[in-house]
Interface confidence: low
């Protein structure tokens, strides 16, 4: 049929933090490049029906289903989902194509199903069918990569037994220390499984799929570097492969490297050597020690020796089960309103942990940094001086760990007041927790200096939203104070705040706040 319009159906994946149900509009979000969904004419269907390729979406992902129509004149449209009509607003792009979009924010089970788009153009009517389902991630796994020697070649293969099959990449860096951070220009990434260039300073292999990204660093002893003050330590679980690389550079080729475990030379077949000349014509040698599947008796000090360099050792510890070692006692901190402060947790763990920081039911990304002594540290500085409970949670394949922190912000009390027919209450969230006084204002005491002690009840309560403490004081109404102005004052080491309340008949009460420093 010559009159049929040219239809293009695309899926746009969004990286967004918003949450809402389907919106039929263009919605401002950070987007991935569009994926063509085909949109083929459906054979043997009554009327003109186009069918887009099935769309699989992760839970909570945000997408846009978009149709581009190359047809003359205006178009009108209607979306139908689960027998409900949804508003449809076509617009035209720079090439004068009609564009119709359906935005699905934060995909849920209820938003999965068939989305029908009915389009009416001047020439013809047609229907476009999208089928959206939630990706089943229950069977997904992401395993930490490990190394194998390539048969008959001086090369390493990086393997990650994950589902769906991961993209494997080598992350290489030839600089020292900080400049080997992931985003650094010194870092080179190679999306391949086999690596021949094994002479670099820092070699990691990473595997990524829909579940995230896991990396393994090639453990290296560099004989040209000053040995660490504490012996480097490598943990492995029984059955895992062991790889240690010893690297040395010398002015000429007249040197050799050897590996020993507890002063006994490694057996043939548990090491291999490579050498190359660097750009300045010095010789680089590397000697790998490897065990394809470690047992408990592979534990010990592995020492790399050279005829021209001081020897260096590493302690290899084989464990039956992974662990996370850290002190889990809760910690309380008290800081000033503008004081710089970070929570930190120091831990030793194997395998590497996945972690989160949580505050007020909101999770924050967790970064971890290795220290020279075999420990790692995770810091959280993004508290924005909000008082309350902060939780650090870490887990690996075999262990879990949770640590609680309380943050208190030192500040002068601020008082809020409310009153009912029978009582008046004042609240304050200052820190340290304030003390209270109630004063009666009368002809005898125009400055409100007459203290009230009868009928006062003080308490501290946890304001659940932020996990911070709120102090309150309640004054029970008595005939002696009815109709008078009373003043509640909260004070701590940083100052005092007061609120004045008129105790009369029920109804709206006028409050007057006094700030006394």
């Amino acid at each position: 049929n010559q009159d049929l319009p040219v239809i293009k159906c695309v899926l746009i994946n969004h990286k967004n933090n918003d949450s809402s149900v389907g919106k039929s509009s263009s919605y401002p979000m950070v987007s991935e490049s569009p994926e063509d969904l085909g949109c083929a004419l459906r054979p043997q269907s009554s009327g003109t029906v186009y069918e887009a390729a099935a769309v699989e979406v992760d839970v909570s992902a945000s997408i846009t289903l978009q149709v581009l129509v190359d047809a003359p004149g205006n178009i009108s449209c209607l979306w139908v989902f689960k027998h409900s009509s949804l508003n449809c607003q076509p617009h035209f792009d720079l090439q004068n194509r009609g564009v119709v979009s359906m935005v699905i924010l934060k995909m849920t089970e209820t938003q999965a199903g068939e989305y029908l788009l009915f389009i009416q153009s001047e020439a013809t009517n047609y229907t476009i069918l999208f089928t959206v389902s939630i990706r089943n991630t229950l069977l997904y796994t992401l395993r930490r990569p490990y190394f194998r020697k390539m048969e008959n070649q001086d090369a390493l293969v990086c393997i990650s037994e994950s589902v769906p099959e991961p993209i494997v990449e080598w992350v290489l860096c030839d600089s020292q220390g900080e400049s080997c951070k992931e985003e650094s220009p010194a870092v080179v990434k190679k999306e391949e499984k086999v690596l021949h260039e094994l002479f670099g300073t820092d070699i990691r292999c990473c595997a990524r799929n829909e579940l995230g990204r896991e990396c393994t660093r090639l453990f290296t002893i560099d004989l040209n570097q000053t040995p660490q003050t504490t012996l480097p330590q490598l943990f492995l679980k029984v059955g895992e492969p062991l790889w240690i690389r010893c690297k040395a550079v010398h002015v000429n080729h007249g040197f050799g490297l050897t590996w020993e475990l507890e002063n006994k030379a490694l057996e043939e077949g548990n090491y291999f050597e490579m050498s190359t000349y660097s750009t300045n014509r010095t010789m680089i040698r590397i000697l790998f020690a490897f065990v394809s599947s470690v047992a408990r008796n592979d534990t010990g000090y592995y020492t790399c020796s050279s005829s021209k360099h001081p020897s260096q050792s590493a302690l290899v510890t084989i464990v039956e089960k992974g662990f996370i070692n850290a002190t889990n006692s809760s910690e309380d901190y008290e800081i000033d309103q503008y004081e710089e402060f970070c929570f930190s947790v120091r831990f030793k763990a194997y395998p590497q942990i996945r972690c989160t920081w949580t505050f007020s039911r909101k999770s924050f990304p967790c970064e971890q940094k290795g220290l020279d002594n075999g420990y790692s540290i995770s810091k959280f500085c993004n508290h924005k001086h909000q008082p309350g409970e902060y939780i650090f949670h870490a887990e690996n394949d075999d262990a879990q760990f949770t640590k609680m922190f309380t943050l208190n912000i030192r500040r002068k009390p601020q008082v809020l007041a409310e009153a009912s027919a029978s009582q008046a209450s004042c609240f304050s969230d200052g820190y340290p927790l304030p003390s209270w006084t109630w004063k009666k204002c009368s002809d005898k005491s125009p400055n409100c200096t007459e203290e009230i002690t009868e009928g006062v009840w003080n308490r501290k309560a946890n304001r659940k939203v932020f996990g911070q403490w709120v102090s309150s004081s309640t004054l029970n109404m008595s005939e002696a104070i009815k109709g008078f102005l009373v003043k509640c004052c909260a004070y701590n080491s940083l100052g005092t705040s007061c609120e004045t309340i008129l105790l009369n008949s029920p109804g709206p009460f006028p409050f007057i706040q006094d700030n006394i420093s």
């Epitope: 099959e165 290489l172 860096c173 030839d174 600089s175 220009p185 010194a186 870092v187 080179v188 990434k189 190679k190 999306e191 391949e192 499984k193 086999v194 021949h196 260039e197 670099g200």
Partner: antibody
Framework: QVQLVQSGAEVKKPGASVKVSCKAS????????MHWVRQAPGQGLEWMGI????????SYAQKFQGRVTMTRDTSTSTVYMELSSLRSEDTAVYYC?????????????WGQGTMVTVSS | DIQMTQSPSSLSASVGDRVTITCRAS??????LAWYQQKPGKAPKLLIY???TLQSGVPSRFSGSGSGTDFTLTISSLQPEDFATYYC?????????FGQGTKLEIK
């Protein structure tokens, strides 16, 4: 527009070295890898190696290891390929080609080629 | 090294024909395959990457398919400007390797 401009043809004697340059323009030089590929007369394409202009790191095909050196000058957005100990079988057209850092995107922009003739 | 084998090494066809060139890898390379077109005296031109993705600016009569070890380049309707040599190339692991080329000639 994005382009790679290579240096002119060279005639060399066996045992000598040749240094071919490739000047990039129209894109951020350090954001893409650069490959060198050669083609002997009437033959197919042969990959020689790759350089990352960002850090200067290289990876060479085993066949050329020890004879080839790839370098770059970020101030002029130029990469260089030097081949030493030339033999007659090194007579070929040498191409530089840009590639995305995610390898499977292929080599999307090529230089015009530099003919190197090795003859006594 | 991964060997790439193209077939046929040459083929004759006419304008309007549908042409298929195959490429086989000596081991699985997932979808890490590109196709190039080269005309005499010119540099190669990228047609397809990631086995099936058309490089921008390349006519839609070119298409690629396959994954693992077997790949295909198809030209749905030959045009006069399509007569050239075609190469496949893997970027799964270094060294990157090319097929030996398929020369497409006018019948």
């Amino acid at each position: 527009q994005v382009q790679l401009v290579q240096s002119g043809a060279e005639v060399k004697k066996p045992g000598a070295s040749v240094k071919v340059s490739c000047k990039a323009s129209g894109y951020t030089f350090t954001n893409y890898f650069m490959h060198w590929v050669r083609q002997a007369p009437g033959q197919g394409l042969e990959w020689m190696g790759i350089i990352n202009p960002s850090g200067g790191s290289t990876s060479y095909a085993q066949k050329f290891q020890g004879r080839v050196t790839m370098t770059r000058d970020t101030s002029t957005s130029t990469v260089y390929m030097e081949l030493s100990s030339l033999r007659s079988e090194d007579t070929a057209v040498y191409y530089c080609a840009r590639a995305h850092t995610v390898y499977y995107y292929g080599m999307d922009v090529w230089g015009q080629g530099t003919m190197v003739t090795v003859s006594s | 090294d991964i060997q790439m084998t193209q077939s046929p090494s040459s083929l004759s066809a006419s304008v309007g024909d549908r042409v298929t060139i195959t490429c086989r890898a000596s081991q699985s390379i997932s979808s890490w395959l590109a196709w190039y077109q080269q005309k005499p005296g010119k540099a190669p031109k990228l047609l397809i990457y990631a086995a099936s993705t058309l490089q921008s600016g390349v006519p839609s009569r070119f298409s690629g398919s396959g994954s693992g070890t077997d790949f295909t380049l198809t030209i749905s309707s030959l045009q006069p400007e399509d007569f050239a040599t075609y190469y496949c190339q893997q970027s799964y692991s270094t060294p990157w390797t090319f097929g030996q080329g398929t020369k497409l000639e006018i019948k």
